[in-house]
Interface confidence: low
Amino acid sequence: ASVGLPSVSLDLPRLSIQKDILTIKANTTLQITCRGQRDLDWLWPNNQSGSEQRVEVTECSDGLFCKTLTIPKVIGNDTGAYKCFYRETDLASVIYVYVQDYRSPFIASVSDQHGVVYITENKNKTVVIPCLGSISNLNVSLCARYPEKRFVPDGNRISWDSKKGFTIPSYMISYAGMVFCEAKINDESYQSIMYIVVVVGYRIYDVVLSPSHGIELSVGEKLVLNCTARTELNVGIDFNWEYPSSKHQHKKLVNRDLKTQSGSEMKKFLSTLTIDGVTRSDQGLYTCAASSGLMTKKNSTFVRVHEKPFVAFGSGMESLVEATVGERVRIPAKYLGYPPPEIKWYKNGIPLESNHTIKAGHVLTIMEVSERDTGNYTVILTNPISKEKQSHVVSLVVYVPPQIGEKSLISPVDSYQYGTTQTLTCTVYAIPPPHHIHWYWQLEEECANEPSQAVSVTNPYPCEEWRSVEDFQGGNKIEVNKNQFALIEGKNKTVSTLVIQAANVSALYKCEAVNKVGRGERVISFHVTRGPEITLQPDMQPTEQESVSLWCTADRSTFENLTWYKLGPQPLPIHVGELPTPVCKNLDTLWKLNATMFSNSTNDILIMELKNASLQDQGDYVCLAQDRKTKKRHCVVRQLTVLERVAPTITGNLENQTTSIGESIEVSCTASGNPPPQIMWFKDNETLVEDSGIVLKDGNRNLTIRRVRKEDEGLYTCQACSVLGCAKVEAFFIIEGAQEKTNLE
């Protein structure tokens, strides 16, 4: 057989025995001559060098570049490949010689005592037990112990080859401590040497780097990276690191096995990379690879090296954040810095502490943003080493979708007297203010008599055919007033009013307000009745503990049996076709009330008096009257709202101020409460008296001091009082400059 590629000028060495395989008997002499075109050498089995005593290599007598190999009295162990080759080349000729020794059919290894085979428990791996044969066609089996098991070649995954040995799937013998090959020749058994079985693991479960990410250092600091490999038992691990700067003088690698708990099914290996003083060139990706021979796993981390400790805001740090009421707001402090800075958040100068509604950390999170969260938030980053500080202001604007104030107040069944002029109002609060408020209408019967439409409590008006109020044909004559802006409960609100010049037809009116973040609407049932009329005495919403009377007036010639009822607490049942005054047909939901009857020349008046009204008295009151002729019942409903008593509060602060002599001071003090509080002003705890220079306007809300003098300096107090108590705010006014002397002195 030939080995290597023939070069242009050299032929392969030529052997005297022109065969690939030669079979000879033991105790005979093996002699092969090799001829070539330059210096030759021989290699033979077992001892692959020229030191074997029994083997003789001699120069041929008949020519240059010729060598004869002679082995007298060959034995089975001389079985193997004999190679003749040109020195310093790959060009060779090979013959495989079997020395048939039936007393020793297996070639013994040089170490003779026993061999070692390394196996893994991998199902797909096979192992070769190197029991080579001196006879090519032996009947060989493999014995494993203990317990004793015999494996016979199956023509598939179990086989024996005289030149290679016994091949078997490794998991089949992984239980065994030792194995050997056995050959049967003429009912005689011959055994190879014993091979000790060593099970070697290969599985790497994971490779973990610590720290795993976000590693930052400044020049000169020490970098320590730990790489831990977790493996199955019987595994040996090689670690290999890749890093940016390979030429580092102060780089140190330490590999060691880590102890695991006894009985653990796992081994741990640790490789520690240390760089004593990092430089900028050490910045980059660090990769640790752990290899078990059959398996490699790796992990990487990025190491950032800064010139020196620093802190700065990232370019994406927002200056304006917009949100809608109820949303979760996240304002991340986007920074570049090493080491990570201490982060402190302030709102309008006041430090923010985390609680269940707000988390002030790397990200400022407001769980459910409300209007009061609007403002300027300052984030201050402090470098913990250099103490360098950076601050950034973020303005948070909280938008409010339109909210219509009266929506929760008005009963869906209010009634209006025929022929009267009525004003419908929508008071809208929205941020930003609504860019439009539109009014729509439709006839009550168009909406109410739509049996196919399902009616719900949230949408008692299933109708969709809304018409613009400009198109009032077939309805009431309407005029929409220009929107007004009013400060109500300390909030800027938009008030839209719609004037119905004569209440002739029952209709539904809808106002719709829209701003950039949403829309709000309110549907008003405008039920026109020719029946009784309800009025309130006094003609305003009562406050708790005040008295109020509800008057029901009906034409005596038309109506009789006037009765007052109150709607029960359960929601008004609404039936399709009966909207919006179903109360007369469903008296079960009403509570009958005691009332006093008065009469004048034309009307009966039924008066129901509430002394010391309470919040429980709020609700829908129904006056029922019966038509004298038809006996048909007519109902009118009036919703009564009782205002809660609220102690006085003053919105906004009085500011200390410094003014020069001769200038003017104007301050205002807005108070709220129910009943409305009285406002009084004091200077240095004495009641402030109006004179030519001191002017109080708008119910004492606004104080003006004209042409201030030195004696106007002092502590000014605004006090708002009602029966529920007082609230006050104070400010000190400093007057600068010298008082000019007047001629009068």
Epitope: F302, A323, L336
Partner: antibody, heavy 120, light 111 residues
Framework: CQSLEESGGRLVTPGTPLTLTCTVS????????MGWVRQAPGKGLEWIGF?????STYYASWAKGRFTISKTSTTVDLKITSPTTEDTATYFC????????????????WGPGTLVTVSS | AVVLTQTASPVSGAVGGTVTIKCQAS??????LAWYQQKPGQRPKLLIY???KLASGVPSRFSGSRSGTEFTLTISDLECADAATYYC?????????????FGGGTEVVVK
Amino acid sequence: CQSLEESGGRLVTPGTPLTLTCTVSGIDLSSYAMGWVRQAPGKGLEWIGFISSSGSTYYASWAKGRFTISKTSTTVDLKITSPTTEDTATYFCANNYDDYGDFLHYFNIWGPGTLVTVSS
Amino acid sequence: AVVLTQTASPVSGAVGGTVTIKCQASQHIYSNLAWYQQKPGQRPKLLIYAASKLASGVPSRFSGSRSGTEFTLTISDLECADAATYYCQSYYYSSDSTDNTFGGGTEVVVK
């Protein structure tokens, strides 16, 4: 040294999904965001979206539903879910190596681009 | 989304001269604007970020400025190598949008 290289650009028929891959070198994707920008022949640059260091994705309003960005430890993929002829362009992946974290702002490292042609 | 409107192409300048390119934002984006240079068949190159900060390795002949929502890129001491298309890009993320927009581009011709 940080570098980006796009691959996967080829001629596709309309409606055939196509995935482009950006292979990064020297950049830790767990610390940096990566973005995609495209440029139709003879036209200007158009921002598609980016994937943050934590894996959150952000898309231009026109790109939502049309593209999907995902990543492994060393690659960032851009999937064009149902290409149309209007998606014919050179696609660049880009990164800001100076400004790592949740958002991708301006781009100071760009790949050479890969050409996608959508034609029936 | 922010819309960026750039100076119409082309803008011409002589070698050694100065050219300015404007970029108008449709809403407040503060200083969140970058400028890029792109030559035919090449990838874009960052010149300016944060409206006026010079990117590393960019000659000081390039400068950026901001006035409200109008941004300007100025190239002074013009060289032949400056012939390219210049793009502005906003990277302002508001609560309802993460649109990161490029302007339409302005071609600079050097005579």
